[in-house]
Interface confidence: low
């Protein structure tokens, strides 16, 4: 009876629900993640258990420090929801649900260039497309490693387009594009495409 009374007393302020979190919320399949289950009470020896839906994944003991569960998100159903249980003797509380968002990484985009050559100018159209990766995808175009466009968001699987007009250059210029989506710190780049300088018949991309 005393244990029950103690438990009921703890259920007020001393023993609130634990918090389940991860530094990484947007992941790709195959990614390792660390889930942190923490509790405001730093003086109790707490047993933490992690669940995905109703499946028990693991248990750790902790006192003052969060329990860390290292997982690999390999399949869609492993996105969640996850729940953490904090238990002291017969008292237990559950966290709110936590789910990951699985995003397919963008594959390296392909850059295509079309040029209309006039006597004085080059009218350049750049197309960039990543054929795989969760939408939306943000594309940015670069000339000689310097961004020349804002991020262009595409919500369907179609190429981003960027137009520019240049005076016929005397030097080669290198173009590439970057594709990124919601995956943090994950961007891919196209192969560079070099535009030769104007000298004779040296514009393989040109429509004249």
């Amino acid at each position: 009876r005393k244990a029950v009374l103690d438990c009921e007393a703890m259920k007020t302020n001393e023993f609130p629900s634990p918090c389940l979190d991860s530094k990484t919320k947007v992941v790709m399949k195959g990614q390792n993640v660390s889930m942190f289950c923490s509790h405001k009470n730093k003086s109790l020896q707490i047993t933490y258990s992690l669940f995905r839906r109703k499946t028990h994944l693991g248990t750790q003991d902790g006192k003052g420090e969060p329990a860390i569960f290292n997982l690999s998100i390999t399949e869609a159903h492993e996105s969640g929801p996850y729940k953490c249980k904090a238990q002291v003797t017969s008292c237990s509380k559950y966290s709110r649900d936590f789910s990951f968002t699985i995003v397919d990484p963008v594959t390296s985009p392909v850059l295509n260039i079309m040029v209309i050559q006039t006597e004085t100018d080059r009218h350049i159209t750049l197309h960039c497309l990543s054929v795989n990766g969760s939408l939306p995808i943000n594309y940015t175009f670069f000339e000689n490693h310097v961004a020349i466009s804002p991020a262009i968001s595409k919500y369907d699987r179609e190429p981003a387009e960027f137009n520019l007009t240049k005076k016929n250059p005397g030097e080669e210029e290198e173009y590439r594009c970057e594709a990124k989506n919601r995956l943090p710190n994950y961007a891919t780049y196209s192969h560079p495409v070099t535009m030769p300088s104007t000298g004779g018949d040296s514009c393989p991309f040109c429509l004249k």
Epitope: K29, G30, N32, T107, A187, Y189, H191
Partner: antibody
Framework: EVQLVESGGGLVQPGGSLRLSCAAS????????MSWVRQAPGKCLEWIGT???????YYASWAKGRFTISRDNSKNTVYLQMNSLRAEDTAVYYC???????????????WGQGTLVTVSS | IQMTQSPSSLSASVGDRVTITCQAS??????LAWYQQKPGKAPKLLIY???TLESGVPSRFSGSGSGTDFTLTISSLQPEDFATYYC?????????????FGCGTKVTVL
């Protein structure tokens, strides 16, 4: 059915060159990274290099400079150009397809049957 | 990264439980695969991501471990399991790439 068939192996003199081919069928080569792996008689498997879907190539440190991987998506074929061959390059050469899964899961789900290269005078 | 397999060979009988270990020279997380190879044949994928069984592979094969130490276990050796087993670490990103194989463990009939 997914198939990889290597060809081009044979006897070559030290210092010579050879180009191996890997013909893919049952899938589109353009959407898969591919690797070459070799195995000397009675020895370990040894990774040579990988070519990505956009033709970026990666090589083992010992293979850089002598070995070149390329692909022709229109022919659904991957190539391994080998130059300045030495006796120690004698091995069965396999091409292998990286798994269809994502970047970090780059194990080999499909292998060819291998082609034997013998470097000897 | 170097992959060290042990033992290099072992003899066992049908029905035996067989354990093969693989050690990476630095932490590779769970980026490890196991292959089976029979004489004159190409390797066959058994396990990837350290512990995930490839489709069609019998459940007597299992993998475990993460970081630097990994294990392949055959719970009850069958006649068709006598072969050489290789571990492989893998890593591919936009900036670098490598794959490294262990030198194999040959499982022969006792």
């Amino acid at each position: 059915e997914v198939q990889l068939v290597e060809s081009g192996g044979g006897l070559v003199q030290p210092g010579g060159s050879l180009r191996l081919s890997c013909a893919a069928s049952g899938f589109s080569l353009s959407s898969h990274a591919m690797s070459w792996v070799r195995q000397a008689p009675g020895k370990c498997l040894e990774w040579i290099g990988t070519i990505s879907t956009i033709d970026t190539t990666y090589y083992a440190s010992w293979a850089k400079g002598r070995f070149t991987i390329s692909r022709d998506n229109s022919k659904n074929t991957v190539y391994l150009q080998m130059n300045s061959l030495r006796a120690e390059d004698t091995a069965v050469y396999y091409c292998a397809r990286l798994s269809e899964l994502y970047t970090t899961n780059s194990y080999y789900s499909r292998w060819g049957q291998g082609t034997l290269v013998t470097v000897s005078s | 990264i170097q992959m060290t397999q042990s033992p290099s060979s072992l003899s066992a009988s049908v029905g035996d439980r067989v354990t093969i270990t693989c050690q990476a020279s630095e932490s590779i997380g769970s980026l490890l695969a196991w292959y089976q190879q029979k004489p004159g044949k190409a390797p066959k994928l058994l396990i990837y991501r350290a512990s995930t069984l490839e489709s069609g592979v019998p459940s007597r094969f299992s993998g475990s471990g993460s970081g630097t130490d990994f294990t392949l276990t055959i719970s009850s050796l069958q006649p068709e399991d006598f072969a050489t087993y290789y571990c492989q670490s893998y890593h591919y990103s936009s900036s670098s790439s490598y794959a490294a194989f262990g030198c194999g463990t040959k499982v022969t009939v006792l």
